[in-house]
Amino acid sequence: EVEKTACPSGKKAREIDESLIFYKKWELEACVDAALLATQMDRVNAIPFTYEQLDVLKHKLDELYPQGYPESVIQHLGYLFLKMSPEDIRKWNVTSLETLKALLEVNKGHEMSPQVATLIDRFVKGRGQLDKDTLDTLTAFYPGYLCSLSPEELSSVPPSSIWAVRPQDLDTCDPRQLDVLYPKARLAFQNMNGSEYFVKIQSFLGGAPTEDLKALSQQNVSMDLATFMKLRTDAVLPLTVAEVQKLLGPHVEGLKAEERHRPVRDWILRQRQDDLDTLGLGLQGGIPNGYLVLDLSMQEALS
C-alpha cells in the first residue's frame, strides 16, 4: 500500500542486526538499504529471520543486482542461498572454490537440491574441466557426485583428478561411467607398484577390458568376490579357469555361492567342465567333455 512505502521515522537500518526481525515485511522493504545488505550479507546467517523476511531480503538483492549477484555477495549468502531458484543461480559467475564450499556447507548432510546442482554445473562449466580440487570438494559433500555425471561429462575429468576419488564415490556408477573412468585411473596410477596399484585401481575395474584382467591375474592380486562380480561380463568371459583362479587367489571359493549370478554364471557356461572340476568347488554347467567349441566371433573376424 502507498502509505507503507516510506520508512517510518527512526526505523532506517544503519546495520544488519537482530533488531530487524521485529520489522514487518513492508518495513524491511522500506528501511533496509540494499547496498547495506550486500556489504553485511555475512550477518544474515546469525539472525533468525522468518521465511517471509528472507523473501524480502532476496527481493532487495535482486533489485540491486538484476544481472546476477557478484561473488562477494554470493559467498556470504548462507541460508538465504536456499531461497534462490536455479534461474537465479544461472545468472551467477562463481569462480572461487571458497565460494562453492561456503554454499555447499549450507546444504551439508542433505541430498543435492536443484539449487546446488545448478551451482555445481555453473562452477564446473566456468572452470572448463573437473580439476582435482573441485572434485575433492564435491565428493566430500556428495560422495555420489561422480556417478551423477554422464559419460560425456566424465570425459572432461583429467586423469590427475582421479587421485581424489574414494571407493565409496563410485558405489552408484554404472558400467558406462566406469568405462570412461577406468582408462583415466589406469593412466593416473601407472607409476605405482603392483600391490599399491591394485588397491587404487580396484574400484575402477568395472570398466577394465579382458587383457587388463589377464595381466592382473599374473600379479597375485587376490581380488575379492565383490569386485569380481562388478566386472564387465564381456571382459570376464574370455578368461580361462586358470586365470580366474590366479585373479581371485584364496577368494576363488566364493565362486560357488555366486554360480547363478552374472558374470559367474555366463563365465561357467563358456568353460570346459573338466577345467571347472579342477577348482574342486562343484561348479556345474560347463561345456561337457568331448564337445568342440567354435569361436564364431574369431571365424567372422577372419572372413
Epitope: F49, Y51, E52, D55, L82, G109
Partner: antibody
C-alpha cells in the same frame, strides 16, 4: 488463534502406505515452515521432516529418507506426509508443528494422530 | 546429524525445589536451542527458544542458559504443574534433532 489438526492415522500393514494431513488455521499458512515430529509409544520425540513456506526446500530425518515425502498445499492450508514402505518402527503418534524460519523453533503443535504399523 | 544428549533421564524432586536439566550438542549449535515441556497424552509445548528466551505466556520460574555445546534448563521453584517430560532440540541445521528427554517426577 493458531490451530493445527492432524488426520489420516490408523492401522496399516508393514510395507503399505499411508497419507497424513494437517489442517492449519489462525495464521498465514503460506508464510511459515511446517514440520512433522513423531513419538513412538513410551519413547521420546523424533523430528521427521520440514518443508519451507513456499515448498522450495524439504529436509528429512535419515530414518525416513526415501520412504516419506512431505508436501503442502498453500491454497488449502494443508500439510501432508506421504508414508511408503511402512515398518513396525514407524508406529508412533505423528504431530505437525509450525516454524517461522530456518532458525526458529517449533512454536505451535497439533494434538497428533496415531499410526500403527502391524501385521 | 547433530546428536543431542540430555541428563539426567529421570529426576525426582519436590514442590519448591530448584531443578536443573542439562543438554549437550555433539557440535556447536551457537544458541539455536529450544526447550519443550510435554505432559502424558498431550502435544509438546515450547518453553524456551534461542537458549535463553522465554516464550510468551511461560512462567518466569523457567530459565535457560548456555551456548555452543552446553545448555541448561532451570526451574527455580518447582510447581505441581511442572511434573512432566522436558526435551531440548537444536535448530541450527535443517534436521532439527531432539534430546532423549528428562522426566521430572514427584519425589
Amino acid at each position: 488463534q493458531v490451530q493445527l489438526v492432524e488426520s489420516g492415522g490408523g492401522v496399516v500393514q508393514p510395507g503399505r502406505s499411508l497419507r497424513l494431513s494437517c489442517a492449519a488455521s489462525g495464521f498465514t499458512f503460506s508464510s511459515d515452515g511446517m514440520n512433522w515430529v513423531r513419538q513412538a509409544p513410551g519413547k521420546g520425540l523424533e523430528w521427521v521432516a520440514v518443508i519451507w513456506n513456499d515448498g522450495s526446500n524439504k529436509y528429512y530425518a535419515d530414518s525416513v529418507k526415501g520412504r516419506f515425502t512431505i508436501s503442502r498445499d498453500n491454497s488449502k492450508n494443508t500439510l501432508y506426509l506421504q508414508m511408503n514402505s511402512l515398518r513396525a518402527e514407524d508406529t508412533a503418534v505423528y504431530y505437525c508443528a509450525r516454524d517461522r524460519g530456518p532458525l526458529w523453533p517449533l512454536d505451535y503443535w497439533g494434538q497428533g494422530t496415531l499410526v500403527t504399523v502391524s501385521s | 546429524d547433530i546428536q543431542m544428549t540430555q541428563s539426567p533421564s529421570t529426576l525426582s524432586a519436590s514442590v519448591g525445589d530448584r531443578v536443573t536439566i542439562t543438554c549437550r550438542a555433539s557440535q556447536s549449535i551457537s544458541r539455536w536451542l529450544a526447550w519443550y515441556q510435554q505432559k502424558p497424552g498431550k502435544a509438546p509445548k515450547l518453553l524456551i527458544y534461542k537458549a535463553s528466551s522465554l516464550e510468551s505466556g511461560v512462567p518466569s520460574r523457567f530459565s535457560g542458559s548456555g551456548s555452543g555445546t552446553e545448555f541448561t534448563l532451570t526451574i527455580s521453584n518447582l510447581q505441581p504443574d511442572d511434573f512432566a517430560t522436558f526435551y531440548c532440540q537444536q535448530y541450527n541445521t535443517y534436521s532439527r534433532t531432539f534430546g532423549q528427554g528428562t522426566k521430572v517426577e514427584i519425589k
